[in-house]
Amino acid sequence: LIIGFGISGRHSITVTTVASAGNIGEDGILSCTFEPDIKLSDIVIQWLKEGVLGLVHEFKEGKDELSEQDEMFRGRTAVFADQVIVGNASLRLKNVQLTDAGTYKCYIITSKGKGNANLEYKTGAFSMPEVNVDYNASSETLRCEAPRWFPQPTVVWASQVDQGANFSEVSNTSFELNSENVTMKVVSVLYNVTINNTYSCMIENDIAKATGDIKVTESEIKRRSHLQLLNSKAS
């Protein structure tokens, strides 16, 4: 969380951003909130990016003002216009690109004053893993698959019964480049698994950490997965 204060002029307002990550090819949100003003027309929102000459986005007098918008963001940005009045200056970024990573500034002007806060935005690819029993294999084998990751992640297997055990000798992980030549499909196979145990496939890079769990018993198979972004720090 980054909290910024205006320094020019008599009054400053509090602006708060949260570092976040964007998933390549999907829509992302750059989070920013501020001390609200009572009239929408008194609020100006400017999003800027370090190293980019034009604006990322500008909202003033109750509507988007995109005449100064940089070409790389053309047609890809929007604020939540109905929430600006309650202090939400967050920016929706469509079709996130690898090159969207960097330092952004959320700059706010209201009738009370000015304020800004920076936001670190990372980009990459991350997806939920799915763990299945591989019935085609000669021995009891688990297969963990996740369709899109970038940068290349690490994959670690763990087991509830054999806590702390190192499964690197009995697992094999491969990374297959996807058709857009950036993201990769992750496939990891774990051999010699035992019944009545819960196994976890953990995939992690510097942006996200995802876990797929599978519990195999004689009567049923239970699966669970979750994904966590690693750099959600507020400013």
């Epitope: 909130t33 009572i38 009239k39 007098e61 929430q83 009045i85 309650v86």
Partner: antibody, heavy 122, light 113 residues
Framework: QVQLQESGPELVKPGASVKLSCKAS????????IHWLKQSPGQGLEWIGW????????HYNDKFKGKATMTADKSSTTAYMQLSSLTSEDSAVFFC???????????????WGQGTLVTVSA | DIVMSQSPSSLAVSVGEKVTMSCKSS????????????LAWYQQKPGQSPKLLIY???TWESGVPDRFIGSGSGTDFTLTVSSVKAEDLAVYYC?????????FGAGTKLEIK
Amino acid sequence: QVQLQESGPELVKPGASVKLSCKASGYIFTDYTIHWLKQSPGQGLEWIGWIYPGSGHTHYNDKFKGKATMTADKSSTTAYMQLSSLTSEDSAVFFCARGGESITTVFPLAYWGQGTLVTVSA
Amino acid sequence: DIVMSQSPSSLAVSVGEKVTMSCKSSQSLLYSSDQKNYLAWYQQKPGQSPKLLIYWASTWESGVPDRFIGSGSGTDFTLTVSSVKAEDLAVYYCHQYYSYPPTFGAGTKLEIK
């Protein structure tokens, strides 16, 4: 139709806290601000602040910062206001009201609850 | 904070009469960007919660009888009841939402003779 149902009257001791509720129905709870106001014989109508249940954002009148805390529960479409360190000055009727339709301002206040009487007395 | 001053504090009129009440603000409520006055009028009947009558100084809230007329601009505003009915017995408040914190007048109490 839009309705705001407030909790019943409260008799509380000085120094204690009280939590008032405002149950909203008849509209999308997360799309509008809920405001709290105080009405006392000495001070008339005073605006305490608003909460936007969609995000949890709040905005307070400086006069009530530290005295009032507004929260909202989306699942039950209920807004709450806790008043702390109560004194006789806090004895009043408290209203919740829904913010306006426009995205250009959260006012005026077109829908009001029936009010909750809070009496602070030893 | 913007101070709202209402006058008179109370007045008594007969049914059918016309009545006017005044509201003055300590600074202009006319916003140059949209040429709107950020002022509302509320009616509060005995034992009830306030009810919105007028906003933007002169726009009727849905369902409000047209005998209630809001007028004025800048710092001086008026609420007129063209032909008072017995049910209009209430306190009338003006309210500015031009700047935070929004503030209310002390009210004008309308009594029926």
